[in-house]
Interface confidence: medium
């Protein structure tokens, strides 16, 4: 079996001019391609992998939401030579990440890493963005985490930082097929320079309190204080699976319009981000979809 092979980390690594072909090892009978796109309120980026796969042919698409960070995952496996170039790698060029200018800043600033390398997303070096509230959701927390995509025996990972809806989440995550988006949230401007070692205790959790011994004359107090030595149960997560529309484009001859932008265009948005998706400006699913070439 011969498959296309590439790795894209928020760059043009899977653009068709960079497309390679590889011969799969004996016994490998599927080609795979996986695309994971992450969208913050200040932009989006994607990871993608193509290569020789394992398992059965088929498709698996999913949408995920981690405190207002949206993730769209598409996995496609097929059993024909060079069949793994069907996923659309076109981007909905957000403007700049939607109609940001329509929303006034809410006073919180966060470090933003959207498609930045790990080196560029260290400490206080990333750009600072002003958070805003969108679609009746309050984005007053800052996030520091990672997105990881694993497919075709390759794992790619990039940092993610930005504004989120939760100020206290700790080591929270969502997963899809071969995909993980995880990290922690914090409260206060520019608090997300490094949350890797954040513990589960946060301002939302009442501290342990040593009560003074009751005085003999005191009537039993009506106030109760709960203490616990185990990790507290966090408030119900806002993470929820969401249907991700597919943008499957069968590979055809070159008469098929074909080009791609920086990231996958996974058409359609998710609840909570509709206001910033500029959805009216882009072809609907089934419209012109163009896996890009950038080259020869």
């Amino acid at each position: 079996l011969e498959c296309y092979s590439c790795v894209q980390k928020a760059d043009d690594g899977c653009s068709p001019n960079k497309m390679k072909t590889v011969k799969c090892a004996p016994g490998v009978d599927v080609c795979t391609e996986a695309v994971g796109a992450v969208e913050t309120i200040h932009g989006q980026f994607s990871l993608a992998v193509r290569g020789c796969g394992s398992g059965l042919p088929g498709k698996n698409d999913r949408g995920l939401d981690l405190h207002g960070l949206l993730a769209f995952i598409q996995l496609q496996q097929c059993a024909q030579d060079r069949c793994n170039a069907k996923l659309n790698l076109t981007s909905r060029a957000l403007d700049p990440a939607g109609n940001e200018s329509a929303y006034p800043p809410n006073g919180v600033e966060c470090y933003s890493c959207v498609g930045l390398s790990r080196e560029a997303c260290q400490g206080t070096s990333p750009p600072v963005v002003s958070c805003y509230n969108a679609s009746d959701h309050v984005y007053k927390g800052c996030f520091d985490g990672n997105v990881t995509l694993t497919a075709a025996n390759v794992t790619v990972s990039l940092p993610v930082r930005g504004c989120v809806q939760d100020e206290f989440c700790t080591r929270d995550g969502v997963t899809g097929p071969g995909f993980t988006l995880s990290g922690s949230c914090c409260q206060g401007s520019r608090c997300n320079s490094d949350l890797r070692n954040k513990t589960y205790f946060s301002p939302r959790i009442p501290p342990l309190v040593r009560l003074p011994p009751p005085e003999p004359t005191t009537v039993a107090s009506t106030t109760s204080v709960t203490t616990s030595t185990s990790a507290p149960v966090r408030p119900t997560s806002t993470t929820k699976p969401m249907p991700a529309p597919t943008s499957q484009t069968p590979r055809q001859g070159v008469e098929h319009e074909a080009s791609r932008d920086e990231e996958p265009r996974l058409t359609g948005g998710a609840a909570g981000h509709q206001d910033r998706s500029n959805s009216g400006q882009y072809p609907a699913k089934g419209g012109p979809q163009q896996p890009h070439n950038k080259g020869c």
């Epitope: 001019n17 060029a93 791609r260 932008d261 070439n293």
Partner: antibody, heavy 117, light 111 residues
Framework: EVQLLESGGGLVQPGGSLRLSCAAS????????MSWVRQAPGKGLEWVSY????????YYADSVKGRFTISRDNSKNTLYLQMNSLRAEDTAVYYC??????????WGQGTLVTVSS | QSVLTQPPSASGTPGQRVTISCSGS?????????VHWYQQLPGTAPKLLIY???QRPSGVPDRFSGSKSGTSASLAISGLRSEDEADYYC???????????FGGGTKLTVL
């Protein structure tokens, strides 16, 4: 059918500037990556620059980096190449090309740029 | 000096089979990057002839075929016709240069 029509070529002195345009029709221009490829008289093809469909990413050959700027106006279905500090070696026919599935699948007829004193 | 090396000229008689070679290196064709071929008839713009090593766009006759092996690729034209007289260019991406590259072109003459 993909149609690309270049314009703006002509004679210019060394050090001068020129702006090429490419009017596109017959396909969804705003979804296509676009390129400029040039061909010096009697010579082969040389890739010059390309731009992403939104215009947010641009790439250049080393020979033109810092002197040429590629841009696009999706509302007008038009691709541009601003050429500054032109040199004699920039003399060529400049083609606008659509980047399709793996390859340049649509080409304009070209516009001649002559840099001479 | 082109990154991809092609013979400057090739020739054949009508009906004959002609092959044009394209030699690259480990940073382009040998790195696994797909190869494309363009045909440029006299006085006209280039036209895509073969993409993705061996795929033909619609409208291109099956007399034209492409192949790739190691660091080289080749274009074969069978049943040569007078209208095939043109310049032929191979192209691929180059890892070390980080850009698309073309061969120097081969001028095909139909005798």
């Amino acid at each position: 059918e993909v149609q690309l029509l270049e314009s703006g070529g002509g004679l210019v002195q060394p050090g001068g500037s020129l702006r090429l345009s490419c009017a596109a029709s017959g396909f969804t221009f705003s979804s296509a990556w676009m390129s400029w490829v040039r061909q010096a008289p009697g010579k082969g093809l040389e890739w010059v620059s390309y731009i992403s469909s939104s215009g947010s990413s641009t790439y250049y050959a080393d020979s033109v980096k810092g002197r040429f700027t590629i841009s696009r106006d999706n509302s007008k279905n038009t691709l541009y190449l601003q050429m500054n500090s032109l040199r004699a070696e920039d003399t060529a026919v400049y083609y606008c090309a659509r980047e399709g599935l793996w390859a340049f699948d649509g080409w304009g007829q070209g516009t001649l740029v002559t840099v001479s004193s | 000096q082109s990154v991809l090396t092609q013979p400057p000229s090739a020739s054949g008689t009508p009906g004959q089979r002609v092959t044009i070679s394209c030699s690259g290196s480990s940073s382009n064709i040998g790195a696994g990057y797909v190869v494309h071929w363009y045909q440029q008839l006299p006085g006209t713009a280039p036209k895509l002839l073969i993409y993705d090593n061996n795929q033909r766009p619609s409208g291109v006759p099956d007399r034209f075929s492409g192949s790739k092996s190691g660091t080289s690729a080749s274009l074969a034209i069978s049943g040569l016709r007078s209208e095939d007289e043109a310049d032929y260019y191979c192209a691929a991406y180059d890892d070390s240069l980080n850009r698309p590259v073309f061969g120097g072109g081969t001028k095909l003459t139909v005798l």
